[in-house]
Interface confidence: medium
């Protein structure tokens, strides 16, 4: 039978009349239009909706935004729009929120044609006050903060400067004309890039890369020949332009750009892109494009310093520059990334990986599914993941792939069953093991969202009808309730939920439409009086991370260590609570040649542990340039997978020896850097 | 208007293979699906496949698999469906059909599984020695 | 494979009568089901699709209910141009399947 439908499935006691006291409507006075909504700060319970409405005229465009703000988690709004002197808002560079628990929020202004710059209103006080400031520019992007200091903010303007503001932006300043790109880096650094000649497009590979580490006072030129940048985790990256040809490189900096070493990666031509797909402190995961329209590239894993890169994944999906892929980080369980191939047929497949991309598998076919008509034999396929580039492509998917770092080991997504993804009407998956096995959890496309840390699930059906109806499931998805939340069924636009997965709230987004009128209206549903309890110590059971072999010593050893969570029973009906913190119990584990990659010039052959030299590069001297140094770089051919914890074990050791050889493949050597000061 | 206008009947021999065309006016070709659907003499409609215009991504019947393949060209809005190794009992009426299926299109009114809106005309197939 | 079992296969019905046709489907389809009208020498037209949703330019009189396995089309006052074969299609999994038809002739 399908989920839920079980005779075991146990009901949640009285819950229609809990949750009816715990429904909150609130319809706005609005037109139609767009909605778009920020939360403001962690756990304040502050929501900030910006309704906007245009009403095109023969000559122009008038439009008409509203400002709406909660303080309960969405149960009640107040219309400040007054606060904001009733100007229409740009929703374009949406609600630009201050980092952590700032309270700082920037909204953006329409301001008439002829005026001589834009217009912001700020508020430091979770959106109570705002405070208009008129611009000495013209905005192109959204104002940024600075992750270290959120009362400094840059932005780019129209004229192409960049204009810095070290006071929340009451006062700003030009530090640079003609830049193209800019992004803070770590210690309230900017690096961006600026053109010479003409424009950022007609001067794409010959940009240069700029770093200001005083907001502006003093500039260091870090980079020339750029395409572009990019950072990532503690690397920053940059494509540079060959000397020779029209090929570009990447080139990698972990010192914020004063020294760099070219990457071990395959260079690109005009057509084909670079992307980082996920990067963190120790590691990076490149996407390299193939030549040609292929649709498809190949992922690299980085080692510790981002120069030396490991093949991942062939005839990895992503379809152009800025384009779609489904590369998803699974952020419930440590090590685990799923994404989709282009197999030689055209067909698209769903990989998945349990040690960040050393290797990859299908997904296991879920236990209560059947296989579809993309499978050639019925009884062996497995499961497929819609994600990014299914909802590109119209397919009927009305969500990504979802997990949380804080419900450990819950992973949602759509999906279908067979040898590829199906162009079918996908239903919903769930695992409870960050994607080991699945179990079809909703028939159907759904909307869902994760609450209190896993306690809750919930999820709207993605239908073509108004709808009135609300599901929810207090045990990781084996069994759905379901609660009607309203007499008159809303056309459904959206789920809303506190970003961090810890809250009981749940806001449900729609529009009613009668003969004449279109109105905005959302419901909160408060789920706190479902878990009528605090969870305790016996609620919880010791479950091993990545457990795939009970009997064998090194089970759930993953880059060198294993994990042993608490987690909630899904038979405990009780609340995590807003201050729930994982609590896991990691333990070292011995090194085995799985622990180490290929240094550059060994691979892997297929179903061996084993880094062998490769055939065209035995007996060459490896080169390449490490910190800026010139150096002559010998190797047994192994190097420890960042972030591998092992100890012990087998310990390949690696030399590295100093000769004065010169360095020939560093566009960005010192000798192309200089400094200046303003 | 909206249409889909088939190619002509096509007389066919045991093994040979025939390549039915389909092609589409009066909207955006890349935003619906097209499935093929046939119909034997005096029988009733049986689904061959779907493509999708965009990616040209295909899901076939089982019973069709490694016989049918499904093309097309965006170039021209038309769409193909070739099915090899005929038999007598593939002689039928094979139509082209409008599908949004899976696809959902802007707009609230619109989502969810709408049925094969637009037919071609039928194409007839007949498969004899 | 969803099997889509139409009854009765035929159904004879006096013209200004109500004519009811079931589907019904081995699995649950949700509301993932069209119904389709074919007269002789004709491609098949769609009349409701999400089970219960008329097509642009059908009928009030053609209405369409049930949701999961259940389905029911529902010619409130047949005309003399409703007499035809009548088809259910589900879209719930693939294949799509077709149940195998209802012939509506006059009694």
């Known amino acids: 039978s399908a989920p839920g439908e079980d005779e075991e499935c146990g009901r949640v006691r009285d819950f229609v009349a809990k949750l009816a006291n715990n429904t909150h409507q609130h319809v706005f006075d609005d037109l139609r239009g767009s909605v778009s909504l920020s939360w403001v700060g962690d756990s304040t319970g502050v929501i900030l909706v910006l309704t906007t409405f245009h009403v095109p005229l023969v000559i122009m465009t008038f439009g008409q935004s509203k400002l709406y703000r909660s303080e309960d988690y969405g149960k009640n709004f107040k219309d400040i729009t007054d606060l904001i002197n009733n100007t229409f808002i740009r929703t374009e560079f949406g609600m630009a929120i201050g980092p952590e628990n700032s309270g700082k929020v920037v909204l953006t202004a329409e301001v008439s044609g002829g005026s001589r710059g834009g217009r912001i209103f700020r508020s430091s006080d979770f959106a109570k006050n705002f405070v208009q400031t008129d611009l000495p520019f013209h905005p192109l992007t959204q104002m940024m903060y600075s992750p270290q200091n959120s009362d400094y903010l840059l932005a780019l303007s129209t004229e192409n400067g960049l204009w810095v503001s070290k006071n929340f932006g009451g006062k700003w300043e030009e530090i640079h004309k003609a830049v193209c790109l800019a992004k803070w880096g770590s210690d309230n650094t900017i690096f961006f890039t600026t053109y010479a000649n003409g424009s950022c497009k007609a001067d794409l590979g010959a940009l240069e890369l700029w770093r200001t580490s005083d907001l502006g006072k003093s500039f260091k030129t870090i980079g020339v020949k750029i395409y572009s940048f990019g950072l990532g985790g503690r690397f920053l990256f940059a494509s540079v332009m060959a000397d020779k040809d029209t090929t570009r490189r990447i080139h990698v900096s972990t010192d914020q750009g004063d020294t760099w070493s070219m990457a071990q990666l395959p260079s690109v031509g005009q057509e084909q892109f670079y992307s980082i797909l996920a990067a963190n402190d120790d590691m990076v995961f490149m996407h390299v494009d193939e030549p040609g329209d292929t649709g498809f590239g190949t992922i690299f894993t980085s080692d510790d310093r981002g120069i030396v890169y490991s093949k991942s994944l062939d005839r990895h999906l992503y379809t152009t520059t800025g384009g779609e892929t489904d590369f998803t980080n699974v952020t419930s369980l440590r090590g685990v990334y799923i994404t989709s191939v282009l197999s030689e047929d055209n067909s698209i497949q769903t990989m998945i990986t349990f040690d960040q991309g050393g290797r990859w598998t299908h997904l296991r076919k879920p236990e209560n599914s059947e296989c579809d008509a993309t499978a050639k034999n019925k009884n062996e396929c497995s499961l497929h993941i819609h994600a990014s580039y299914s909802i590109s492509q119209k397919l009927n998917v009305p969500m990504a792939p979802l997990s949380e770092p804080n419900a450990v080991g819950i992973v949602i997504a759509h999906g279908s069953v067979g040898d590829a993804i199906s162009v079918m009407v996908p239903d919903v998956y769930i695992s409870d093991d960050g994607g080991y096995s699945w179990t079809k959890m909703l028939e159907g496309p759904h909307y869902y969202t994760i609450l209190d840390s896993g306690g809750i699930i919930v999820a709207i059906e993605h239908s073509s009808r108004p709808i009135n109806v609300i599901k929810f499931s207090t045990d990781e998805g084996q069994c759905w309730q379901t609660y009607t939340f309203t007499r008159d069924p809303i056309y459904f636009t959206g789920l809303a939920s506190e970003p961090g997965a810890r809250s009981m709230n749940i806001s449900i987004w729609g529009f009613t439409e009668s003969f004449l009128t279109s109105q905005w209206v959302s419901y909160t549903i408060d789920f706190k009086d479902i878990l009528e309890r605090n969870c305790e110590e016996k609620d919880y059971t010791i479950w091993l991370a990545h457990s795939t072999d009970p009997e064998d010593y090194e089970d759930g050893c993953i880059l060198g260590y294993k994990e042993q969570f608490l987690r909630l029973r899904k038979s405990s009906v009780c609340q995590n609570g807003r201050d729930y913190v994982v609590t896991k119990q990691p333990s070292i584990c011995l090194c085995s040649l799985e622990d180490f990659l290929c240094d550059f010039g060994y691979y892997r052959p297929e179903n061996d542990s084993k880094c062998v030299e490769q055939p065209e590069l035995k007996g060459h001297d490896l080169e390449f340039c490490l910190y800026g140094r010139e150096e002559h770089l010998t190797t047994n051919g192994y190097r420890k997978i960042p972030g591998d914890k092992c100890q012990g074990g087998v310990n390949p050791v690696r030399e590295v020896k100093d000769l004065k050889k010169k360095c020939t493949s560093n566009f960005l050597s010192p000798e192309k850097q200089n400094s200046k000061s303003n | 208007q909206v249409q889909l206008v088939q190619s002509g009947a096509e007389v066919k021999k045991p093994g040979a293979s025939v390549k039915v065309s389909c092609k589409a006016s009066?909207?955006?070709?890349?935003?619906?699906?097209m499935s093929w659907v046939r119909q034997a003499p005096g029988q009733g409609l049986e689904w061959m496949g779907i493509?999708?215009?965009?990616?040209?991504?295909?899901s076939y019947a089982q019973k069709f698999q490694g016989r049918v393949t499904m093309t097309r060209d965006t170039s021209t809005s038309t769409v193909y469906m070739e099915l090899s190794s005929l038999r007598s009992e593939d002689t039928a009426v094979y139509y082209c059909?409008?599908?949004?299926?899976?696809?959902?299109?802007?707009?609230?009114?619109?989502?969810?599984?709408?049925?094969?809106?637009?037919w071609g005309q039928g194409t007839t197939v007949t498969v004899s020695s | 494979e969803i099997v889509m079992t139409q009854s009765p296969a035929t159904l004879s019905v006096s013209p200004g009568e109500r004519a009811t046709l079931s589907c019904r489907a081995s699995?649950?389809?949700?509301?993932?089901l069209a119904w389709y009208q074919q007269k002789p020498g004709q491609a098949p037209r769609l009349l409701i699709y999400?089970?219960?949703t008329r097509a642009t330019g059908i009928p009030a009189r053609f209405s369409g209910s049930g949701s999961g396995t259940e389905f029911t089309l529902t010619i409130s006052s047949l005309q003399s141009e409703d007499f035809a074969v009548y088809y259910c299609?589900?879209?719930?999994?693939?294949?799509?399947?077709f149940g195998g038809g209802t012939k509506v002739e006059i009694k």
């Open positions: 493509i999708n215009p965009i990616g040209g991504s295909t």
């Open positions: 699995q649950s389809v949700s509301s993932n």
């Open positions: 999400g089970a219960s």
């Open positions: 059909a409008r599908d949004p299926s899976g696809i959902a299109l802007a707009g609230p009114a619109s989502r969810g599984y709408q049925g094969m809106d637009v």
């Open positions: 299609q589900q879209a719930r999994l693939g294949p799509w399947t």
């Open positions: 009066g909207y955006t070709f890349t935003k619906y699906y």
